[in-house]
Interface confidence: low
C-alpha cells in the first residue's frame, strides 16, 4: 500500500521548506521537489519522504519535478529542472550552473 508509512531505516536529509523545523529531518528517504505554479517563479523544496514513494518515479513535467534518494544528506546539492515547453526544433539554453 503506497499510503502506508515506510518502516525501513531512517536517513537524515537536508530540510529546506516553509514546513521545516530545522536544517535537517529524518525520514525513509530524502526528497527534492521543484514546483512552478502558474505565473510564479519555481520553488525548490528539500525534505524527507515517508509516504507516496510512487511520486519518486514520476516523470518531470513543465510544472513539477520530484526527486528522491536514499542516503545521508543526499538531497543537499541536487538541482532540478522542469521539462522544457519549447518546440522540439529549439534547443534549451544553459543557465550557468
Amino acid at each position: 500500500d503506497p499510503v502506508k508509512p515506510s518502516r525501513g531505516p531512517l536517513v537524515t536529509c537536508t530540510c529546506e521548506s516553509p514546513h521545516c523545523k530545522g536544517p535537517t529531518c529524518r525520514g525513509a528517504w530524502c526528497t527534492v521537489v521543484l514546483v512552478r505554479e502558474e505565473g510564479r517563479h519555481p520553488q525548490e523544496h528539500r525534505g524527507c519522504g515517508n509516504l507516496h514513494r510512487e511520486l519518486c518515479r514520476g516523470r518531470p513535467t513543465e510544472f513539477v519535478n520530484h526527486y528522491c534518494c536514499d542516503s545521508h544528506l543526499c538531497n543537499h546539492n541536487v538541482s532540478l529542472v522542469l521539462e522544457a515547453t519549447q518546440p522540439p526544433s529549439e534547443q534549451p539554453g544553459t543557465d550557468g550552473q
Partner: nanobody, 126 residues
Framework: QVQLVESGGGLVQAGGSLRLSCAAS????????MAWFRQIPGKEREFVSG????????DYADSVKGRFTISRDNAKRAVYLQMNSLKPEDTAVYYC???????????????????WGQGTLVTVSS
C-alpha cells in the same frame, strides 16, 4: 521598493581580510536567494557566492572556495561575505543581489537575480 545596500569594502593588503555586508529593505518574507557578484571594468559581472533562503546551502566560485564564506541573517534581512586570504586579483566592485520572491534555487547566472545593490569597491594591494 526593494533596496540592497552594500558596505564593508575598502583597501586591504594581500593576505588580509574584509567582511562585506548587504542590508536589504523592501523584501517581504525570507524566500529569496541572495548572492554576491563582482566586476572589474571592462569585464562581465562574475558570480562569487550565493546562499539559499534558509542559509542551509551555499555555492562558491572556484576562485574563492576555501577563502570566502557567505552567511545570512534573515531576522536582520542581511547577507554577509567574509573574505580571507585576499589576493590582488580579488580587486573589484562587489555587488549584492537578490532573486525574485519564491526563486529558491542557487544560480550563478546574473540574469536570475532581480534586485541589485550599487556595489562596494574592494581593493587588494600587493
Amino acid at each position: 521598493q526593494v533596496q540592497l545596500v552594500e558596505s564593508g569594502g575598502g583597501l586591504v593588503q594581500a593576505g588580509g581580510s574584509l567582511r562585506l555586508s548587504c542590508a536589504a529593505s523592501g523584501l517581504t518574507g525570507n524566500y529569496y536567494v541572495m548572492a554576491w557578484f563582482r566586476q572589474i571594468p571592462g569585464k562581465e559581472r562574475e558570480f562569487v557566492s550565493g546562499i539559499s533562503w534558509s542559509g542551509n546551502r551555499a555555492d562558491y566560485a572556484d576562485s574563492v572556495k576555501g577563502r570566502f564564506t557567505i552567511s545570512r541573517d534573515n531576522a536582520k534581512r542581511a547577507v554577509y561575505l567574509q573574505m580571507n586570504s585576499l589576493k590582488p586579483e580579488d580587486t573589484a566592485v562587489y555587488y549584492c543581489a537578490s532573486s525574485a520572491p519564491g526563486w529558491d534555487m542557487l544560480r550563478r547566472n546574473s540574469r536570475d537575480y532581480s534586485y541589485w545593490g550599487q556595489g562596494t569597491l574592494v581593493t587588494v594591494s600587493s
